[in-house]
């Protein structure tokens, strides 16, 4: 699997009314990635 993105300290930047993470880390914290093996909806990104 691809290395997880670095998301230490949640990595959130705050703007008026919105926030943004440094990266989209949802894949690394997805249900499918948690399965670790077998066929997963989020295969490693090329």
């Amino acid at each position: 699997l691809a290395d997880p993105l670095d998301h230490r300290d949640a990595g959130d930047l705050w703007f008026p009314g919105e926030s943004e993470s440094f990266e989209d880390a949802h894949v690394e914290h997805s249900i499918s990635r948690s399965l670790l093996e077998g066929e997963i909806p989020f295969p490693p990104t090329s």
Epitope: E23, D24, H29, I31, S34
Partner: antibody, heavy 114, light 112 residues
Framework: EVQLVESGGGLVQPGGSLKLSCATS????????MHWVRQASGKGLEWIAH??????????YYAESVKGRFTISRDDSKTTIYLQMNSLKTEDTAVYYC?????WGQGTTVTVSS | DVVMTQSPLSLPVTPGEPASISCRSS???????????LYWYLQKPGQSPQLLIY???NLASGIPDRFSGSGSGTDFTLKISRVEAEDVGVYYC?????????FGPGTKVEIK
Amino acid sequence: EVQLVESGGGLVQPGGSLKLSCATSGFPFSNVWMHWVRQASGKGLEWIAHIKAKSDNYATYYAESVKGRFTISRDDSKTTIYLQMNSLKTEDTAVYYCTGLDYWGQGTTVTVSS
Amino acid sequence: DVVMTQSPLSLPVTPGEPASISCRSSRSLLTSKGITSLYWYLQKPGQSPQLLIYRMSNLASGIPDRFSGSGSGTDFTLKISRVEAEDVGVYYCAQFLVYPYTFGPGTKVEIK
């Protein structure tokens, strides 16, 4: 087999409260980020809440439309997430889905009406 | 908020023919690591949404390769190379980079 099963929906009067549950199974739960997304009848999808993992101090985020009224939480020991909904409004009427963004539950219907 | 728009909102299709749906975001969804936080879902009638494409161009597992995603930082396209009857439903694009996360209004695909 991955399963996400929502429950707790029903009919409630405006100003009332409901607590939705989403029981999960079939995958290691503790590191997964979870969300609630809702859909009013015949309308599109609206993201409303997000909870991260223990390693992220269970950080939570909300849509402005529910901020201060809804609370997302999780119990890692029960592999369940929750949505406490207070001060409900008629516009909260919708099907509520729990999701990891890849897998989705079947939804539970909340109707707010007098 | 990041506004997601889609066109067309309704798309009559012919089985065996190609189809294309456009999505535009009001700001770039490209991150510093080259990831584009754009996702496509299909909600078939009476069902929950299902993931088709993640991070703009990655095909979700179990999804037929007739589906593909492409685009830039703000303009995205979902293509179906050969539409099948089972592809009917509402297609949504979504961004999961900036809070609040937002979905497009949906494109209803139906057989002519």
